[in-house]
């Protein structure tokens, strides 16, 4: 039997991630909710202990007994100023036990106190279980990552957490080192290299400078902000929409915890959407006092809301360079880590700071650390495969795979171009009262309705106990192995009854030509939405231009270069346009374009006058036309309560 694999775990402040190196490549493992990262949250209730998504999902209902940020406590003394400061912001109680902090909660009706190592061990146990569910056998060996600035006490405490979780901790390695390993920067064979790791996560920001020489890693400098990350950007969005709700509906939702929680969830999703689209919609039914909140935000406005936070990320970069006694030209590689580095503006600021240097960002930034940890785990387990040295390109699913839900809707579980092997699970329910069974119909294709996609197979899950519609929980899992064989399993969670179908490449699957035809067909149908997309694109171009011009003339660097009259002229016109936009989100393409041209007529002569002879077309590289807008409408953010 093949030797059991060792896993790599990125134990993060807000999210954790687990990976394994097998069959010549790294697989980042999804949890039972289909998520490739798992919240580092542990909740205690009257009846059970919850870890991960389940814990985070109920945080607003049970704040005093939902523990997160254990990483901020681990290996620290109670009297540590960091602990004392952080305690003020946590809804759970931290007590002093011989100058060691403990988290006090109510669990099954009793008061319990846990060391940070115990909380972290619970998260590690969850990550271990996620790996075991995927691998199908017990896992004991693991590499766990920690920030480069962790001291020996913090490292030992993390190792202890691993031991409590039943893991044999092969090694504790630095997060930036893991990220560098993920990119194979230790195997370039080009002599000494200076690598800057820019890690902007959910709650923390770390900059590390490493020197790599012949596979030896040395941390030259670390800097950062222990309280800057994605959650801060979420807060800016939440505040923005609270104000918008006030403007639109004359009601303040800020004191209603449930409404704010639901808004925050939608904001977090919108933020993620804005990394790949120039606009995101929020649709929250009955947000407050029965009022539906349907709105949208453009990337430009999000960037404006967070501009100071984004800009502040460069200060630690400068500090780290100073501490490492390096000039920015001496940095060979820039590596992005952490989900917030997906934000285009953050990438642009960093890239501009390094004079246009390419960024290493091909590995999913929230997964890069776990990826590297998994590679290191394989090396430490003696994996001699060449692929540990030369990782293979991953195979992908050529079309989205999903099932039919009410109304003939295609609900995709595995998106087109997902790397395989992959496994995704989703919970579905019944459509009618006392429905005795469900028909699982498996499709592949990119169209919104199943009738336009390709039916791969179908099977029935019967024997569902009588229950009102929406009550039964049917867990459906799509699992594609490395050979492209798809297993679809449906399980009634109340009875454990299950049924499955295996769909192989030769059974009803499409040929390459058919796949190509379907992709082209999907493109053709997309064209039907072009009018809407163009409208949104024109809106985004206008909003982006307005905010860019506003920030351009407000730039401190322009003091003395622009007359107050010209500055006022630009700001007044920007204000006019931005206010008009707020009131006219559904205007026509022509109207948005007209407003943009009007604004350009005012701004361009003034802005270009500033940059004449300066060797460039102006801030952000706009030419006379200004930015022409993005890729059209972003995906709608659906509400999840």
């Amino acid at each position: 039997m093949a030797k059991a694999a060792a896993i790599g775990i990125d134990l993060g402040t807000t999210y954790s991630c687990v990976g394994v190196f097998q069959h010549g490549k790294v697989e980042i493992i999804a949890n039972d909710q289909g998520n490739r990262t798992t919240p580092s949250y542990v909740a205690f209730t009257d009846t059970e202990r919850l870890i991960g998504d389940a814990a985070k999902n109920q945080v607003a209902l049970n704040p005093q007994n939902t523990v997160f940020d254990a990483k901020r406590l681990i290996g620290r003394k109670f009297g540590d100023p960091v602990v004392q400061s952080d305690m003020k912001h946590w809804p759970f109680q931290v007590i002093n036990d011989g100058d060691k902090p403990k988290v006090q909660v109510s669990y099954k009706g009793e008061t319990k106190a846990f060391y940070p190592e115990e909380i972290s061990s619970m998260v590690l146990t969850k990550m271990k279980e996620i790996a075991e569910a995927y691998l199908g056998y017990p896992v004991t060996n693991a590499v766990i990552t920690v920030p480069a600035y962790f001291n020996d006490s913090q490292r030992q405490a993390t190792k202890d957490a691993g031991v409590i979780a039943g893991l044999n901790v092969l090694r504790i390695i630095n997060e930036p080192t893991a990220a560098a390993i993920a990119y194979g920067l230790d195997r370039t064979g080009k002599g000494e290299r200076n690598v800057l790791i820019f890690d902007l996560g959910g709650g923390t920001f770390d900059v590390s400078i490493l020197t790599i020489d012949d596979g030896i890693f040395e941390v030259k400098a670390t800097a950062g902000d222990t309280h800057l990350g994605g959650e801060d950007f979420d807060n800016r969005l939440v505040n923005h929409f609270v104000e918008e709700f006030k403007r639109k509906h004359k009601k303040d939702i800020s004191q209603n915890k449930r409404a704010v929680r639901r808004l925050r969830t939608a904001c977090e999703r919108a933020k993620r959407t804005l990394s790949s689209s120039t606009q995101a919609s929020l649709e929250i039914d009955s947000l407050f006092e029965g009022i539906d909140f349907y709105t949208s935000i453009t990337r430009a406005r999000f960037e404006e809301l967070c501009s100071d936070l984004f800009r502040s990320t460069l200060e630690p970069v400068e500090k780290a360079l100073r501490d490492a006694k390096l000039d920015k030209a001496q940095i060979h590689d820039l590596v992005l880590v952490g989900g917030s580095t997906r934000i285009p503006k953050v990438q642009k600021l960093l890239q501009d700071f390094f004079n246009g240097r390419d960024l290493n960002k091909s590995i999913n930034p929230d997964e890069a650390v776990a990826y590297g940890a998994a590679v290191q785990a394989a090396i430490l387990m003696g994996d001699k495969s060449e692929n540990v040295q030369d990782l293979l390109l991953l195979d992908v699913a050529p079309l989205s795979l999903g099932l039919e839900t009410a109304g003939g809707v295609m609900t995709a579980l595995i998106k087109r171009n997902s790397t395989i092997p992959t496994k995704q699970t989703q919970i579905f329910t019944t459509y009618s009262d006392n429905q005795p069974g469900v028909l699982i119909q498996v499709y592949e294709g990119e169209r919104a309705m199943t009738k336009d996609n390709n039916l791969l197979g179908r099977f029935e899950l019967s024997g569902i106990p009588p229950a009102p519609r929406g009550v039964p929980q049917i867990e459906v899992t799509f699992d594609i192995d490395a050979n492209g064989i798809l297993n679809v399993t449906a399980t009634d969670k109340s009875t454990g009854k299950a049924n499955k179908i295996t769909i192989t490449n030769d059974k009803g699957r499409l040929s390459k030509e058919e796949i190509e035809r379907m992709v082209q067909e999907a493109e053709k149908y997309k064209a039907e939405d072009e009018v809407q997309r163009e409208r949104v694109s024109a809106k985004n171009a206008l909003e982006s231009y307005a905010f860019n011009m506003k920030s351009a003339v407000e730039d401190e660097g322009l003091k003395g270069k622009i007359s107050e009259a010209d500055k006022k002229k630009v700001l007044d016109k920007c204000q006019e346009v931005i206010s008009w936009l707020d009131a006219n989100t559904l205007a026509e393409k022509d109207e948005f374009e007209h407003k943009r041209k009007e604004l350009e007529q005012v701004c361009n002569p003034i802005i270009s006058g500033l940059y004449q002879g300066a060797g460039g077309p102006g801030p952000g590289g706009f030419g006379a036309q200004g930015p022409k807008g993005g890729s059209g409408s972003g995906p709608t953010i659906e509400e999840v309560d």
Epitope: D572, Q575, S579, W580, A583, E600, Q601, Q625
Partner: antibody, heavy 116, light 112 residues
């Protein structure tokens, strides 16, 4: 002082084209948009559209898309309005107008007569 | 498209009296951020080009006599000519610039 001087009257046959010019002086041409307005005999003013004189991007009103083209020549501070495939109902006076907060300076108008 | 409806179509007023012209918009012309209404008034005398009188509802263009005043907000606007003089005989047009531009149909002012 600021002036907009338009080209002289034109008499054209149906199907022909006409190009009306509007020469600006007394200000920086590319700092202000140039609008075009039509007035048929005995009728009111109709906004045809405008051109961003800095970028050269035109905007056409709903009824003026297709046969109309606005252009500029920044070297001579001149805006042009070309109308193709002339019809009898194109007979009108065509005005150019500089735009700041509103159309603060106007050309004297160019009468275009379309007659067979 | 915003439609501007002027009333009356024509108006005869005695010299020295007040003339009032109305302009109704099919949608609000108020920008809540700038707190301005994007409506202008133009005067066109026979055989001449139009001339800008008032912009942003009530701001008089330089050189325009103070007997011309504009008022209104949202969708309803008024041009008032106090103490009508012989040289005020003309057609008066309102025009919106809230989104794209549109002229009203015009109001002819004559001496009674």
């Amino acid at each position: 002082q600021i002036q907009l001087v338009q080209s002289g009257p034109e008499v054209k046959k149906p199907g022909a084209s006409v190009k009306v010019s509007c020469k600006a002086s007394g200000y920086t041409f590319t700092n202000y948009g140039m609008n075009w307005v039509r007035q048929a005999p005995g009728q009111g003013l109709e906004w045809m559209g405008w051109i961003n004189t800095y970028t050269g991007e035109p905007t056409y009103g709903d009824d003026f898309k297709g046969r109309f083209t606005f252009t500029t020549d920044t070297s001579t501070s001149t805006a042009y309005m070309e109308l193709r495939s002339l019809r009898s109902d194109d007979t009108a006076v065509y005005f150019c107008g500089r735009y700041d907060h509103a159309m603060d300076y106007w050309g004297q108008g160019t009468l275009v007569t379309v007659s067979s | 498209e915003i439609v501007l409806t002027q009333s009356p179509d024509s108006l005869a007023v005695s010299l020295g009296e007040r003339a009032t012209i109305n302009c109704k918009s099919s949608q609000s012309l108020l920008n809540s951020g700038t707190r301005k209404n994007y409506l202008a008034w133009y005067q066109q005398k026979a055989g001449q080009s139009p001339k800008l009188l008032i912009y942003w509802t009530s701001t008089r263009e330089s050189g325009v006599p103070d007997r011309f005043s504009g008022s209104g907000s949202g969708t309803d606007f008024t041009l008032t000519i106090d103490r009508l003089q012989a040289e005020d005989v003309a057609v008066y047009y309102c025009k919106q610039s809230y989104t794209l531009y549109t002229f009203g149909g015009g109001t002819k002012v004559e001496i009674k």
